[in-house]
Amino acid sequence: DAHKSEVAHRFKDLGEENFKALVLIAFAQYLQQCPFEDHVKLVNEVTEFAKTCVADESAENCDKSLHTLFGDKLCTVATLRETYGEMADCCAKQEPERNECFLQHKDDNPNLPRLVRPEVDVMCTAFHDNEETFLKKYLYEIARRHPYFYAPELLFFAKRYKAAFTECCQAADKAACLLPKLDELRDEGKASSAKQRLKCASLQKFGERAFKAWAVARLSQRFPKAEFAEVSKLVTDLTKVHTECCHGDLLECADDRADLAKYICENQDSISSKLKECCEKPLLEKSHCIAEVENDEMPADLPSLAADFVESKDVCKNYAEAKDVFLGMFLYEYARRHPDYSVVLLLRLAKTYETTLEKCCAAADPHECYAKVFDEFKPLVEEPQNLIKQNCELFEQLGEYKFQNALLVRYTKKVPQVSTPTLVEVSRNLGKVGSKCCKHPEAKRMPCAEDYLSVVLNQLCVLHEKTPVSDRVTKCCTESLVNRRPCFSALEVDETYVPKEFNAETFTFHADICTLSEKERQIKKQTALVELVKHKPKATKEQLKAVMDDFAAFVEKCCKADDKETCFAEEGKKLVAASQAALGL
């Protein structure tokens, strides 16, 4: 499979348009602060060079690895030292250390301005004036803010982004057509970014084995009719794709993802009956569709798992011969029978099974020792079931905003050292589990809820890793990937926390709050709630709810006032004074 010129090979496989887009994404994900024009210039230079290699694979430098070519190009940026500080030191290293160095400097929370959406007419004019630049700018802005965004999927988003403008800029009511589509793309994009971030964290922090275990469980749920060998092949290929994308090898990743989609569609009959529609679509849509495809029906009359994994006298022999293969088969068999379980639960069960075999296969009577292993699964299954039941009841009682507030209080009390913006962002996302998953029937609730929570808690983990402030967060994030959620759930109020000093400025509000969107207004209120809990961690739920209700009434009253600013100043002081007196701030 060796090619004289890797860059020529990828250019020919992907085509010029995708090649340029993927190089732009790669560069923007590495150098997140560089201006758009600088990246476009670098991409054009790389593209021109790739074309010379396509014409003559033996031309000078065409035999160099993509990391060498791209790294050399990134290191030509004049302002590297003043813009990125110590990242510039990466350029003194040789490959592969240089690329590893660039990867380590990816910033999950870059200091970039919030993307403000211009007026629809302004956007449509820009789209018509220069469609290519407009779409490149989209790729650039998303990639630099989401340095682990799944690159081939970002091409799919860009295609939908283009389609939205093509359709809506000709519509009678441009805004009514365009804005809902852009909102949908934004929300789906954030979700896609967070899901991919978990895959990369899984690979980078816990290794290939952890990712493969996750993939075996998920693909076995999705393709329960496929043989174990087929699932194993898909897992191997999928692991390669994600390892490449998470490692910044975006051209190889996109190419291999296309090959995997092609293979899946050519072998639908032995994989899943649900793939037919997906496989009729063009490449980007096809890959996206396969990744989101619903679970196939379980084969009828699957035998009991106990026969092969508990009752058989060959359990320890089979385990000893090929431990990971045997555990993989256990995970495959369990997962295909349980689309109603979360992937992380299935992985906990597999880990329990592995631990039991490790202990029992060394015992005097192995069978006697592991005979009751399935009984150990019961509490592991019941814990997430009960938690989801309780939280869905709370969500249905409170609604999303107040459910988020309950989680804000809960998590601020658990880990009050975490920054307020991170607590607000993470708790708001945790709270979205209600509207996302509680509407589902029992059989779909757990996979929806617990696997979503894994994605959100990973956001907390990657944000906290940048500036660690809490040993408890570090512990829950690093000890076990599959036990992160139970670890956070088990955290009680941090009794060692010293309450934050009271700062009146934190609780001072102005008339600008009246012009904010409902979402932004909620975030302001939730920010105040977190700060309140940090000042008064012993405040009861009732007291905190009362303060929030007072705050809502205060904002409503002052936003209706003739002199809003005076109202905010005077009534704000009174509210702080009343809260201080009642809570002893």
Epitope: A553, L575, A582
Partner: nanobody, 123 residues
Framework: EVQLVESGGGLVQAGDSLRLSCAAS????????IGWFRQAPGKAREFVAR????????DYANAVKGRFTISRDNAKNTVYLQMNSLKPDDTAVYYC????????????????WGEGTQVTVSS
């Protein structure tokens, strides 16, 4: 003159329902959070429920959650407490209170108090 007048109390059987009313006058009703408190013989006065100036913002003591519902009608300057599935433990004098801040209400403080209405639940 500020007045809060409670009505609707009485003697009922366990499991029955009652609806208490609190009629306010002499102040700008819509600017105040309203709470219901109760005091059983020989016991301290305790918080039952409250409604903020924004009618949807309510809260309840754990003992009454799911059984009692508080609501307000600003046009009539009245607050209601719908009490269902009453228990003998609910026997008390029920007081209505008005306060500028919810946070003071939950700590048992208020600007204005009513005289109370007796609720007796027999088993």
């Amino acid at each position: 003159e500020v007045q809060l007048v409670e009505s609707g109390g009485g003697l009922v059987q366990a499991g029955d329902s009652l609806r208490l009313s609190c009629a306010a006058s002499g102040f700008t009703f819509s600017n105040y959070a309203i709470g219901w408190f109760r005091q059983a013989p020989g016991k301290a006065r305790e918080f039952v429920a409250r409604v903020s100036t924004i009618a949807g913002d309510t809260d309840y003591a754990n003992a009454v959650k799911g059984r009692f519902t508080i609501s307000r009608d600003n046009a009539k300057n009245t607050v209601y407490l719908q009490m269902n599935s009453l228990k003998p433990d609910d026997t008390a004098v029920y007081y209505c209170a008005a306060e500028s801040y919810n946070v003071r209400l939950v700590t048992g403080e208020a600007d204005y108090w009513g005289e109370g209405t007796q609720v007796t639940v027999s088993s």
